[in-house]
């Protein structure tokens, strides 16, 4: 029995819906009391949510997945996954029996966005060309852990005396906080990028420091 | 009446073959997953080997893997186990069982059982 | 390969007493669960299935509980016929499908 999923990863965002694709080809004359579904962890093989005995057997998975009744008969055999959470992602095997066995992996990969970074100075006063300073760029509650890259005016990288550290929370997202030390010069920008590298998405931090006073932008 | 009846069963030496029969009368053979189960003398039930509905898809324990062949004939309504390289280990009561519904699943019809003893 | 556990090994309980029979599965196996019955030189017969469903024409006193890991089959009030060796066999996702090694209920 053929049973088909998605070959990329379905990619879903922390709190929002995810649709778990999965289909077989019913044969003519096909009724739902023919249906064996089994949706499962593929690791653990634990049990996420099943259709036997011509009915919905119910989530087995935190109550937070469904299954769409109305098009199982067609052989779409897709999950909703709802609320999604850092703890779900993995892969998820659709195993489907009528008159014969047939299973396929599906891959979740979920992501939040990381805030728009904030700028610190330390020391944030009194300051001089030639003086060593720390500047911090934290963002927060994001996922997958996130590229952190650091640039001068010019956009030019900068990667000595960098100091990047992720830690995550109770939910799984990570802040990240990136120190970079540099010498000052007469006057130069400092900017911080933090990449998702599932999303694709940029968020931008920067510090302007022109003598006095300085600018955070 | 939904009947089983196994038979082939006897007495054979270590390295042998025997070939189990059984009988499906009273249901659409042709429609459901088959199964063989065993049980040596004084133990309990193992599950040996599956076949669905048009013999596309077979399942054996690890233990019989190599050595045992499930078939099944649905125009004569009978399944088959052919048993090669029997070990004394293979010594048992077969059962044949017909899944309760299209997909496999639990047992609800067994046979009487047929004796295979293993022995020189 | 999924492991089912059954316990006690032997049940001593007299008649009209009530028994409690335990399956426990190495992992989790849903409600792919059956229960079967087996007096000494017949087949067994199918009891439960989907963990708690009663088979066709098993009397009310047998039911079945329990999902994922954890599996009891209960025989209310037992009679001089349910004293038997009783196993229980998942069903879940591929083959092989094994049984527990079986719980014996005998007349105390």
């Known amino acids: 029995l053929e049973v088909q999923v998605p070959e990329d990863p379905v990619v879903a965002l922390v709190g929002t819906d995810a649709t778990l694709c999965c289909s077989f080809s019913p044969e003519p004359g096909f009724s739902l009391a023919q249906l064996n579904l089994i949706w499962q962890l593929t690791d653990t093989k634990q049990l996420v949510h099943s259709f036997a005995e011509g009915q919905d057997q119910g989530s087995a998975y935190a109550n937070r997945t469904a299954l769409f009744p109305d098009l199982l008969a067609q052989g779409n055999a897709s999950l909703r996954l709802q609320r999604v959470r850092v703890a779900d992602e993995g892969s998820f095997t659709c195993f489907v029996s009528i008159r014969d066995f047939g299973s396929a992996a599906v891959s979740l990969q979920v992501a939040a966005p990381y805030s728009k970074p904030s700028m610190t100075l330390e020391p944030n006063k009194d300051l001089r060309p030639g003086d060593t300073v720390t500047i911090t760029c934290s963002s927060y509650r994001g996922y997958p852990e996130a590229e952190v890259f650091w640039q001068d005016g010019q956009g030019v990288p900068l990667t000595g005396n960098v100091t990047t550290s992720q830690m995550a929370n109770e939910q799984g997202l990570f802040d990240v906080h990136s120190v970079l030390r540099v010498v000052l010069g007469a006057n130069g920008t400092y900017s911080c990028l933090v990449r998702n590298p599932v999303l694709q998405q940029d968020a931008h931090g920067s510090v302007t420091i022109t003598g006095q006073p300085m600018t955070f932008p | 009446e939904v009947q089983l009846l196994e038979s082939g069963g006897g007495l054979v030496q270590p390295g042998g073959s025997l070939r189990l029969s059984c009988a499906a009368s009273?249901?659409?053979?042709?429609?459901?997953?088959m199964t063989w189960v065993r049980q040596a003398p004084g133990k309990g039930l193992e599950w040996v080997s599956a076949?669905?509905?048009?013999?596309?898809?077979?399942h054996y324990a690890d233990s019989v893997k190599g050595r045992f062949t499930v078939s099944r004939d649905n125009s004569k309504n009978t399944l088959y186990l052919q048993m090669n390289s029997l070990r004394a280990e293979d010594t048992a009561v077969y059962y044949c069982?017909?899944?309760?519904?299209?997909?496999?699943?639990?047992?609800?019809?067994w046979g009487q059982g047929t004796t295979v003893t293993v022995s020189s | 390969e999924i492991v089912l556990t059954q316990s006690p090994g032997t049940l001593s309980l007299s008649p009209g007493e009530r028994a409690t029979l335990s399956c426990r599965a190495s992992?989790?196996?849903?409600?792919?669960l059956a229960w079967y019955q087996q007096k000494p030189g017949q087949a067994p017969r199918l009891l439960i299935y989907g963990a708690s469903s009663r088979a066709t024409g098993i009397p009310a006193r047998f039911s079945g509980s329990g999902s994922g890991t954890d599996f009891t089959l209960t025989i209310s009030s037992l009679q001089s016929e349910d004293f038997a060796v009783y196993y229980c066999q998942h069903y879940y996702d591929w083959p092989p499908y094994s049984f527990g090694g079986g719980t014996k209920v005998e007349i105390k």
């Open positions: 076949i669905n509905w048009n013999g596309n898809s077979t």
């Open positions: 992992q989790t196996v849903g409600s792919y």
């Open positions: 009273g249901f659409t053979f042709s429609d459901d997953w």
């Open positions: 069982a017909k899944s309760r519904t299209t997909y496999y699943s639990s047992m609800d019809v």
